[in-house]
Amino acid sequence: RAVPGGSSPAWTQCQQLSQKLCTLAWSAHPLVGHMDLREEGDEETTNDVPHIQCGDGCDPQGLRDNSQFCLQRIHQGLIFYEKLLGSDIFTGEPSLLPDSPVGQLHASLLGLSQLLQPEGHHWETQQIPSLSPSQPWQRLLLRFKILRSLQAFVAVAARVFAHGAATLSP
């Protein structure tokens, strides 16, 4: 677990969990609904999702200088996606199969965010938009878009943790 004052997280644990997240995100992606996506959702239907960008300090130099900037950004993203996967978009109709990886994905997002959250202090969490109820007919497209952007997010996070485990672990 990361600790206050800018200490390093458990890079190896984070690496393992982020790799698991990558696998789950890819396995969940095709399993989000009962039918093919339709043209009814061509417009942008997801809120602005978090992206890891150049200024977030997730490059090798930024991680060496102060990994906390990058880790905070990853933490914000994990919380954001955890909220989305816990919402009616995924628990409402069309029902996911009982053995859908989405449940595991949700739990793993929570697990990694807890691993990153420093004991005794809380990073400012990016304001999570209050999700208005999604109409059932919108959900297939929303799931598709959320999981697609989550795949990209966890892929970057996994690279960060792989780098940290290889070069920054004590």
Partner: antibody, heavy 115, light 107 residues
Framework: QVQLQQSGAELARPGASVKLSCKAS????????LKWVKQRTGQGLEWIGE????????HYNEKFKGKATLTADKSSSTAYMDLRSLTSEDSAVYFC????????WGQGTTITVSS | DIVLTQSPATLSVTPGDRVSLSCRAS??????LHWFQQRSHESPRLLIK???QSISGIPSRFSGSGSGSDFTLSINSVEPEDVGVYYC?????????FGSGTKLEIK
């Protein structure tokens, strides 16, 4: 197997409140929504609202806002519906159900409002 | 709100008959329509989901068709235990609504 076990019949006075329960078993309670449906004697089905236990989010039929309040206790896998300011119009059978496309319904709870 | 109109209100049939129950939506709901059967003093039972998808444990004589705003539930050889009220339900958008029901009787 999936089961939704509802609380027993209740007789209530006009103006009173009642709390109905629906205990889920046989599936992961937080994976699906839990809905409530009203059926008056000899009448059709009316959706009251639903709760998503994972997030706690609720959606209500406008007609039942102020009448029904839905809650869920994840630790006991139980959903609740509070009905307040009861009148004779609230006398009905109330069903709980999971997502429509799963087809799991409770056995119903009969509420009789009478002075 | 989406209004579902079912017809006929009552259907009186002989065992072995093939019957069709109609459900019309006030606007297009794609295939987000479910069919339920309710026998006297019982909970509703899901027969067909998403207009035409069959449900495990439901006899194969029940089938559904339609998309958009016109839907049909067919029972290809009615049995005495099929008596009850059949409801179609809008699963497309809030508020969820049910048709007023078709009562199936056996002559």
């Amino acid at each position: 197997q999936v089961q939704l076990q509802q609380s027993g019949a209740e007789l209530a006075r006009p103006g009173a409140s009642v709390k109905l329960s629906c205990k889920a078993s046989g599936y992961t309670f937080t994976s699906y929504s839990l809905k409530w449906v009203k059926q008056r004697t000899g009448q059709g089905l009316e959706w009251i609202g639903e709760i998503h236990p994972r997030s706690g989010n609720t959606h209500y039929n406008e007609k039942f806002k102020g009448k029904a309040t839905l809650t869920a206790d994840k630790s006991s896998s139980t959903a609740y519906m509070d009905l307040r300011s009861l009148t004779s119009e609230d006398s009905a059978v109330y069903f709980c159900a999971t997502n429509w496309d799963l087809g799991y319904w409770g056995q119903g709870t009969t509420i009789t409002v009478s002075s | 709100d989406i209004v579902l109109t079912q017809s006929p209100a009552t259907l009186s049939v002989t065992p072995g008959d093939r019957v069709s129950l109609s459900c019309r939506a006030s606007q297009s709901i794609s295939d987000y329509l479910h069919w339920f059967q309710q026998r006297s003093h019982e909970s509703p039972r899901l027969l067909i989901k998403y207009a035409s998808q069959s449900i495990s444990g439901i006899p194969s004589r029940f089938s559904g068709s339609g998309s958009g705003s016109d839907f049909t539930l067919s029972i290809n050889s009615v049995e005495p235990e099929d008596v009850g009220v059949y409801y179609c339900q809008n699963g497309h958008s809030f508020p969820f609504t049910f048709g007023s029901g078709t009562k199936l009787e056996i002559k």
